[in-house]
């Protein structure tokens, strides 16, 4: 086996040239580049039915530079890739593959959830909302006066909206019905309805004194003795203290 | 005509290190890339690595902590050291020569020679 | 490293007879596939390179197909001489490996 003489081959490529343009160091006629001047990649360039030898300085779409001691190439991303940072890092897949962790994946893993705009597989959002504000005043028709029985409403703020598998967001604002002493609307705050309203009562009583001038029960309602005053005003506490109680129990909440 | 002639011991004891020389004739070592290519008896070949026309090496990562590919110019020789050989080392060893990704791979080869490890 | 797996291993025919034999890479080579002759007590001999170009000189019953990962070498009509081993090689990247072998032997 340790001949002294080595097999004689005929030169594979005798058009083999050193004046090669773009780029190439060594090409040929049929071939095009066969080697690549230094910091240029070589790659097969398909131009229908034949593959010619080409040099570029980056590699087209679909592959990534491989650098080997005077020897540089474009390879070819993972038949599932469209662009590549190396053989085992892609970074944008090929249509109906999701990308995640530099992979290809038809499906994304258990926890992530593919995004259709970016073709990623991404974290699964759930919604988050603040705290709830303090309820509001007890009010009705607008108003802090004038009635009873009214409602009163407190809100909260969506912080992060959700990802398509993502919790929904909870309702961020509540209502509930709230009891509350009457009091009569001073001047300011009496609105047009309010106005028309005491006129009306105002008509209806002035009738109904007219009407009964000489009755004694006209005048009961308007002249009070202190025991009698003393008597309404505990008698008052006593439904107040009644209407707390039942406003704790029964706190009616409406959601929108 | 190109031509390749290995030569060096055909016969290394184990741990020692294998040393071939592969004289190259009618093209120079400073264009192309040279390589080392063996076959253990009955199997089939491997590749283990080149130096560039400039002189830079690269070796298979199986191999690549025993071998060592250097070249004198002026010879328009290259060589191949392979350390702490054993029995598993002994191979045809051939050199070859490509000159690009565009062209024939090792479309010249030399006629090869036998290294046998034994004690 | 990107293996080679060629097949059959070896394979009996006659002179006439067309004979295929495949390599299958581990992935995509792009095209970057040699395919070679080996003579027993012989260095090899390059007969197709970039998956279907001959090397000058070599009869074009000999040729090369594939892409990808698949890759054929196929001998449209066996001739004497052309009873040897054959292997594939990959280069698309480094390091770089053959396939284990085909032997063509007369049947």
């Known amino acids: 086996q340790n001949a002294s003489r080595g097999r004689r081959q005929r030169r594979m490529h005798p058009n083999v040239s050193q004046g090669c343009q773009g780029g190439c160091a060594t090409c040929s006629d049929y071939n095009g580049c066969l080697s690549c001047k230094p910091r240029l990649f070589f790659v097969l360039e398909r131009i229908g039915m034949k593959q010619i030898g080409v040099c570029l300085s980056s590699c087209p779409s679909g592959y990534y530079g491989t650098r080997y001691p005077d020897i540089n190439k474009c390879t070819k991303c993972k038949v599932d890739c469209d662009t590549c940072f190396n053989k085992n890092f892609c970074t944008k897949c090929k249509s109906g593959f999701y990308l995640h962790l530099g992979k290809c994946l038809d499906s994304c893993p258990e926890g992530l959830e593919a995004n259709n705009h970016t073709m990623e597989c991404v974290s699964i959002v759930h919604c988050e909302a603040s705290e709830w504000s303090p309820w509001s005043p007890c009010m009705k028709k607008g108003k802090t006066c004038g009635f009873k029985r009214g409602t009163e409403t407190r809100v909260r703020d969506i912080l992060q909206h959700p990802s398509a598998k993502g919790n929904l967001c909870p309702p961020t604002s509540e209502t509930r019905t709230c009891i509350v002493q009457r009091k009569k609307c001073s001047k300011g705050e009496r609105g047009k309805k309010g106005r028309e309203r005491k006129r009306k009562k105002l008509n209806k009583e002035e009738r109904k004194e007219t009407s009964s001038s000489s009755d004694s029960k006209g005048l009961e309602s308007s002249i009070e003795t202190p025991d009698q005053q003393e008597n309404k005003e505990r008698q008052q506490q006593q439904k107040r203290r009644a209407r707390d109680k039942q406003q704790k129990s029964v706190s009616v909440s409406t959601v929108h | 005509e190109v031509q390749l002639v290995e030569s060096g011991p055909g016969l290394v004891k184990p741990s020692e290190t294998l040393s071939l020389t592969c004289t190259v004739s009618?093209?120079?070592?400073?264009?192309?890339?040279w390589n080392w290519i063996r076959q253990p008896p009955g199997k089939g070949l491997e590749w283990i690595g080149y130096?560039?026309?400039?002189?830079?090496?690269y070796q298979n990562p199986s191999l690549k902590s025993r071998v060592t590919i250097s070249r004198d110019t002026s010879k328009n020789q290259f060589s191949l050291k392979l350390s702490s050989v054993t029995a598993a080392d002994t191979a045809v060893y051939y050199c070859a020569t490509y000159y690009g990704y565009g062209g024939p791979w090792f479309a010249y080869w030399g006629q090869g020679t036998l290294v046998t490890v034994s004690s | 490293d990107i293996q080679m797996t060629q097949s059959p291993s070896s394979l009996s025919a006659s002179v006439g007879d067309r004979v295929t034999i495949t390599c299958k890479a581990s992935?995509?080579?792009?095209?970057?596939l040699s395919w070679f002759q080996q003579k027993p007590g012989k260095a090899p001999k390059t007969l197709i390179y970039?998956?279907?170009r001959l090397v000058d000189g070599v009869p074009s019953r000999f040729s090369g197909s594939g892409s990808g990962t698949d890759y054929t070498l196929t001998i449209s009509s066996l001739q004497p001489e052309d009873f040897a081993t054959y292997y594939c090689l990959h280069y698309d990247e480094f390091p770089l490996t053959f396939g284990q072998g085909t032997k063509v032997e007369i049947k």
């Open positions: 970039l998956t279907n």
């Open positions: 130096i560039s026309y400039s002189g830079k090496t």
């Open positions: 992935q995509d080579i792009d095209s970057y």
């Open positions: 009618g093209d120079s070592i400073t264009s192309g890339y």
